[in-house]
Interface confidence: low
């Protein structure tokens, strides 16, 4: 079953390569188990950036080696992607799945275009 997912159209990563955005889904039922996946689409290729399964009302936790962190509040997920470089510029799609209880719902956002600008290297100092 389809579910609406909203996310911002454009986000500019910080100079430290960190980008944050909110992924909001219109939950049609009372889900207890939710899975959030961030997909990156670039040059017609879709790759999974990170994923987390969480229980409603509990903290959203990604794997220790994930470049993503996040928190959940109701039907909103606040996602942060770290370690981004200019080559990582692309469309980042938020996918939300209501895994349990049935029925299964799937929502895929239109994507957030994340622009990453590598910082200029600091000029050599005389000191």
């Amino acid at each position: 079953k389809a579910m609406h997912v909203a996310q911002p159209a454009v986000v500019l990563a910080s100079s430290r390569g960190i980008a944050s955005f909110v992924c909001e889904y219109a939950s049609p039922g009372k889900a207890t188990e939710v899975r959030v996946t961030v997909l990156r689409q670039a040059d017609s290729q879709v790759t999974e950036v990170c994923a987390a399964t969480y229980m409603m009302g509990n903290e959203l936790t990604f794997l220790d080696d994930s470049i993503c962190t996040g928190t959940s509040s109701g039907n909103q997920v606040n996602l942060t992607i770290q370690g981004l470089r200019a080559m990582d510029t692309g469309l980042y799609i938020c996918k939300v799945e209501l895994m349990y209880p049935p029925p299964y719902y799937l929502g895929i956002g239109n994507g957030t275009q994340i622009y990453v600008i590598d910082p200029e290297p600091c000029p050599d100092s005389d000191f």
Epitope: R35, T37, L39, V46, E48, C50, A51, A52, T53, Y54, L60, T61, F62, L63, K95, E97, M99, Y104, L106, I108
Partner: nanobody, 119 residues
Framework: EVQLQESGGGLVQPGGSLRLSCVAS????????MGWYRQAPGKQRELVAT???????IYADAVKGRFTISSDNDENTVYLQMNSLKPEDTAVYYC?????????????WGQGTQVTVSS
């Protein structure tokens, strides 16, 4: 088609331990998530714990600190180590495998294994 076979259930005294196992066989699409659910008499089936290489391990509040989910290296088997069992843990425990992708490819359930905690 994916088949799931649970084992390890039984009768145990309060405070005791059990280890459940679930073996998945057949043609499995990756990535996938394997987890454990339980259903007590007259209650809805509820999540106990789920384990995913592409996501986080989560536990129901009622079992945190007592139950541990793990999987073997090839990820076709998932275990549930249950310690400090309580009478309220009595239920049929089901193994579940969800094949993931852009869409949910498959959602499979085992037949269940009975766990009874009683003195």
């Amino acid at each position: 088609e994916v088949q799931l076979q649970e084992s390890g259930g039984g009768l145990v005294q309060p405070g005791g331990s059990l280890r459940l196992s679930c073996v998945a066989s057949g043609s499995i699409f990756r990535p996938y998530v394997m987890g454990w659910y339980r259903q007590a008499p007259g209650k809805q089936r509820e999540l106990v714990a789920t384990n995913s290489k592409g996501g986080s391990t989560i536990y129901a509040d009622a079992v945190k600190g007592r139950f541990t989910i793990s999987s073997d290296n090839d990820e076709n088997t998932v275990y549930l180590q249950m310690n400090s069992l309580k009478p309220e843990d009595t239920a049929v425990y089901y193994c579940n495998l969800k094949e993931l992708g852009i869409y949910l490819r498959g959602d499979y359930w085992g037949q269940g294994t009975q766990v009874t905690v009683s003195s």
